[in-house]
């Protein structure tokens, strides 16, 4: 029978670490991490790490009992967890019977938004207490709410990942800019900034009709030339506060009275701010 892995949590040092080993298995040949999605009961989905590793093809894998994988996550707070993956059979060949290296994977470490993860793996038996053992490590940075997979997570939806404010902005005269945008039921307070290398105008927008989508309009006084300036719309939603996804548009000249407003070149542009 071909070896498979059975993985379980092991937060402390492996018991083999306390034993003296004449020889230890070789290091891993490759270690990779990629995110995968799994559905959860709430109708949402969770993002997990698919950690895969490749064993070196030589006789040292005959000593191999397990591979231990530890993940450290750094964001607002630090997390640390480890799993030990035991091999169910002794290795009878250095490569898979069908060809190629022995490759295994573990899916289980949860992935939070916008977090840098350090994933380390080593084979067991590992090095003796005062020796450096072979190990491999990789970094993995999880995406934020603008990611095409993440944006459908409930946390991201509540932060406005699916909201398109369809910002339009035009220079009415030298002193004012008119900004129009579609509101969202997610919140009722917004901040509109006009930037042309520096901030030349801003306005708080309070939209009392929170429960339905409406088209809001605000006229903002400016202190400089506004044509070609950037409009930045910052929403304030309960779930993300002042750290919600921001949207951008560009100021153009207002059309003459009776001429339709030019929407085409003022599409909302996602900014780089993530919850």
């Amino acid at each position: 029978r071909e070896p498979t892995v059975q993985c379980g949590s092991e937060t402390g040092p492996s018991p083999e670490w306390m034993l003296q080993h004449d020889l230890i298995p070789g290091d891993l040949r490759d270690l990779r991490v990629e995110p995968v999605t799994t559905s959860v009961a709430t109708g949402d989905y969770s993002i997990l790490m698919n950690v895969s590793w490749v064993l070196r093809a030589d006789a040292s894998i005959r000593l191999l009992k397990a591979t231990k994988i530890c993940v450290t996550g750094k964001s607002n707070f630090q997390s640390y967890s480890c799993v030990r993956c035991n091999y169910t059979e002794a290795f009878q060949t250095q490569t898979r019977p069908s060809g190629g290296k022995w490759t295994f994977s573990y899916i289980g470490f949860p992935v939070e938004l916008n977090t840098v993860y350090f994933i380390g793996a080593h084979n067991i038996p590992n090095a003796n207490m005062n020796e450096d053992g072979p190990s491999m490590s990789v970094n993995f940075t999880s995406p934020g709410c603008l990611d095409h997979i993440m944006k459908y997570k409930k946390k991201c939806v509540k932060a406005g990942s699916l909201w398109d404010p369809n910002i339009t902005a035009c220079k009415k005269n030298e002193e004012t800019v008119e900004v129009n945008f579609t509101t969202t039921p997610l919140g009722n307070r917004y901040m509109a900034l006009i930037q042309h290398s520096t901030i030349i105008g801003f306005s708080q927008v309070f939209e009392p009709h929170q429960k339905k989508q409406t088209r809001a309009s605000v006229v903002i006084p400016v202190t400089g030339d506004s044509e070609g300036a950037t409009v930045q719309l910052t929403p304030y939603f309960p779930t993300c506060g002042s750290d919600c996804i921001r949207h951008k548009g560009t100021v153009v000249l207002c059309p003459q009275t009776g001429v339709p407003f030019p929407l085409d070149n003022n599409k909302s542009k996602p900014g780089g701010w993530l919850p």
Epitope: D22, A57, A59, S60, Q92, T95, R96, G99, G100, K101
Partner: antibody
């Protein structure tokens, strides 16, 4: 029946290169590493390197690392060993040898005599 | 690299004799050792692997033993076709090395 059939004898001048082929049959080519071993006249056996036909991973004996190139063509189940900058002490019989479950050499080619002489 | 020391380098024996060849390694190779037989002008032939397992079609008069750093090839009753050179080889991870060989000659 597993067979490894090597190309014929070669005579080369110092500084030249030689490429030896090893055509295999009777087993799944990508499932076993292929090793190359040489034997100088009246001498012992010397491992040169190995290639995994599945993904072309190669491991060399440091002694030959700068001069030997191992390749393979999976479409014709053939492995190749090229040795460059030949010297007179490279005169030897060169063998391809297929690994077993681990790197014992279960099957050998018949050998290719490479003579380096000016 | 792991060094392989084979002894004796040559020996003379008669048909029917029991012959023993030893191979010592510079470090523990956990029985990852093979033995080969080579006749003049021919490729080597696998006799034993994993120190004790017979290769395909190898007569049972050949046997292997040992562990750690010391290994032995034994031919229980030498036959005429056994006069050849014998090599040990470790396969405990590259680079693989061979013993210097033992030539078994007719007494």
């Amino acid at each position: 029946e597993v067979q490894l059939v090597q190309s014929g004898a070669e005579v080369k001048k110092p500084g030249a290169s030689v490429k030896v082929s090893c055509k295999t049959s009777g087993y799944t080519f990508i499932s076993y590493w292929m090793n190359w071993v040489r034997q100088a006249p009246g001498q012992g056996l010397e491992w040169m390197g190995r290639i995994d036909p599945y993904d072309s991973e190669i491991q060399y004996n440091q002694k030959f690392k700068d001069r030997v190139t191992l390749t393979r063509d999976t479409s014709i189940s053939t492995a190749y060993m090229e040795l460059s900058r030949l010297r007179s002490d490279d005169t030897a019989v060169y063998y391809c040898a297929r690994s077993g479950g681990f790197d014992w050499f279960a099957y050998w080619g018949q050998g290719t005599l490479v003579t380096v002489s000016s | 690299d792991i060094q392989m020391t084979q002894s004796p380098s040559s020996l003379s024996a008669s048909v029917g004799d029991r012959v023993t060849i030893t191979c010592r390694t510079s470090e523990n190779i956990y029985s990852n050792l093979a033995w080969y037989q080579q006749k003049p002008g021919k490729a080597p032939k696998l006799l034993l692997y994993d120190a004790t397992n017979l290769g395909d079609g190898v007569p049972s008069r050949f046997s292997g033993s040992g562990s750690g750093t010391d290994y032995t090839l034994t031919i229980s009753s030498l036959q005429p076709e056994d006069f050849a050179t014998y090599y040990c080889q470790h396969f405990w991870g590259p680079p693989y090395t061979f013993g210097g060989g033992t030539k078994v000659e007719i007494k």
